[in-house]
């Protein structure tokens, strides 16, 4: 069908609550494009009827709510005037107790589930709530160890919990809760966050934390396009470089002639006391020679790798 396949990393979600995923893929979605969502390679698009539990809302796929059986690979097809991209998103649904933060020991959790507070500083936690405009979110409540948080050191400001003068005792398991309203119906959204406390290293000698990848392998078909993010948290005043290397060489230099594998432009989100950096690596076409090779994300003295591997053959 002439569409280029792009594989996103897994999304790990909680059953019995709303979830939404936006099919945006700069620069593909910057011009005039049409976006259509499908489930598990079905030829029938996801419904656009807003009363449907699962439906497409503009570029979003919206689950109201997510259910156990919704796990699977979803594709959004982005068609431009002279391009077509099929983005594959693997959604894994798990059962979770209302006040739980940990996700059953699943690896590679995103920065939304693991956040850092800086000792002695005024800092904040963020409740990540990604939903289309049709969803109205009510005020957020914050919990620690299943109990509502209160005290003069804690202030709720929009999607953030401000914590003044962070202490070691502020580590632990948090949850943020909001009521989402869509088409007159109300749903509860609850996100768990594991919070660790860090002391900022003196003399600017901070050690960046690579959130993703986590030294693991990624199954990918030969010939497909693959994009992998490297997510790094670091102090605001850091001078660390972030890059992708292979065989101890910058990927842009290693693949200078073919330009088949390229490093993306670094972006960052600024938090009160730290930044979250993202720099991706794009495999325009995965070749046989890429398998088994560690592609390293470097951030200052920190490193983490991915290794591409062929999917196991399906004998069904």
């Amino acid at each position: 069908d002439g569409c280029k396949d792009i594989f996103m990393k897994n999304e790990i979600l909680s059953a019995s609550q709303p979830f939404a995923f936006n099919c945006t893929f700069p620069p593909i979605t910057s011009g005039e494009v049409s976006v259509t969502w499908y489930k598990n390679s079905s030829k029938i698009p996801v419904s656009k009827i807003i009363q449907s539990r699962i439906h497409q809302d503009e570029t979003w796929i919206l689950f109201l709510p997510m259910e156990w059986g919704d796990s699977g690979v979803y594709q959004c097809v982005i068609k431009g005037r002279d391009s077509c991209h099929r983005i594959h998103v693997n959604l894994t649904v798990f059962e979770k107790h209302w006040c739980d933060t940990s996700i059953g020991g699943l690896p590679n959790l995103s920065d939304e589930y693991k956040q850092i507070l800086h000792l002695g500083k005024d800092d904040s936690l963020t409740c990540h709530l990604h939903f289309p405009k049709s969803c109205v979110l009510g005020p957020i409540k914050w919990y620690k160890d299943c109990n509502e948080i209160k005290g003069e050191r804690f202030t709720v400001l929009e999607t953030r919990l401000l914590v003044s003068n962070v202490s070691a005792e502020d580590r632990g398991n948090y949850a943020c809760q909001a009521i989402l309203t869509h088409s007159g119906k109300q749903y509860e959204v609850l996100n768990g966050i594991t919070v660790s406390i860090t002391e900022r290293a003196g003399y600017g000698g901070s050690v960046p934390k690579i959130i993703y990848p986590k030294n693991h392998s990624i199954e990918v078909q030969l010939g497909t396009t693959l994009i992998v993010d490297c997510n790094v948290t670091d102090t605001k005043d850091n001078t660390n470089l972030r890059c992708w290397r292979v065989n101890n060489t910058l990927v842009d230099d290693y693949y200078d002639e073919s330009k088949r594998i390229r490093e993306g432009v670094e972006t960052h989100v600024s938090f009160r006391e730290h930044n979250l950096y993202t720099v991706n690596i794009t495999f325009l076409e995965v070749k046989m020679e890429d398998y088994g090779l560690p592609f390293m994300c470097h951030a200052g003295v920190s490193t983490a790798y991915i290794i591409l591997q062929l999917p196991a053959p399906d004998f069904r």
Epitope: H97, C99, D100, E169, G172
Partner: antibody, heavy 116, light 107 residues
Framework: QVQLVQSGAEVKKPGASVKVSCKAS????????MNWVRQAPGQGLEWMGM????????RLAQKFKGRVTMTVDKSTSTVYMELSSLRSEDTAVYYC?????????WGQGTLVTVSS | DIQMTQSPSSLSASVGDRVTITCRAS??????LNWLQQKPGKAPKRLIY???SLDPGVPSRFSGSRSGTDYTLTISSLQPEDFATYYC?????????FGQGTKVEIK
């Protein structure tokens, strides 16, 4: 470092009341819940209830409602647990335990003996 | 109220043995479970927080895990200082409840 220091042992007669104190130091006292747990001689642990020093919100186990009062003195970072209408089966060691993270720190315990 | 059923109530073991203690919750408590150690005449001490997070200073021979509503404390190689009584504690919803305790004695 975090410390919870409890008041000394008490001997009380049946029908009387006892008030046990728990003085906290080393953390933000008004930010976290404080629990009370008791342990009868040779028995297991039993949760009695908890109080939040910020606004004195109290939650009690059903069996202690009407007999237990928990209070806070913010100026001295102290929590109090008062148990009234004492009976012999209330003889136990009473512990306070802070929920900076759930039940992270415990007081040394206060032995309350109810005897005629 | 949530019931926590702890087993065994007591066990005899030797130094170096692998010891396993189990708690079963009567309903879903997620990962809101601690393991406590208590020695005679002393206050309980938390070993494990939130099912599997080891408290600072607790030896790595202690570990916690979960399968559904069954929670396990494992001591991989019992040491002389580990002879004590162990309790599980759920804090998912009040009233918080403890297991009945497991006394680990020297064989």
């Amino acid at each position: 470092q975090v410390q919870l220091v409890q008041s000394g042992a008490e001997v009380k007669k049946p029908g009387a009341s006892v008030k046990v104190s728990c003085k906290a130091s080393g953390y933000y006292f008004t930010s976290y819940w404080m629990n009370w747990v008791r342990q009868a001689p040779g028995q297991g642990l039993e949760w009695m209830g908890m109080i939040h020093p910020y606004d004195s919100e109290t939650r009690l186990a059903q069996k202690f409602k009407g007999r237990v009062t928990m209070t806070v003195d913010k100026s001295t970072s102290t929590v109090y647990m008062e148990l009234s209408s004492l009976r012999s089966e209330d003889t136990a060691v009473y512990y306070c335990a802070s929920s900076t993270t759930a039940f992270a720190y415990w007081g040394q315990g206060t032995l309350v003996t109810v005897s005629s | 109220d949530i019931q926590m059923t702890q087993s065994p109530s007591s066990l005899s073991a030797s130094v170096g043995d692998r010891v396993t203690i189990t708690c079963r919750a009567s309903q879903d408590i997620g990962n809101a479970l601690n393991w406590l150690q208590q020695k005679p005449g002393k206050a309980p001490k938390r070993l494990i927080y939130a099912t599997s997070s080891l408290d600072p200073g607790v030896p790595s021979r202690f570990s916690g895990s979960r399968s559904g509503t069954d929670y396990t404390l494992t001591i991989s190689s019992l040491q002389p200082e580990d002879f004590a009584t162990y309790y599980c504690l759920q804090y998912a919803s009040s009233p918080y409840t403890f297991g009945q305790g497991t006394k680990v004695e020297i064989k």
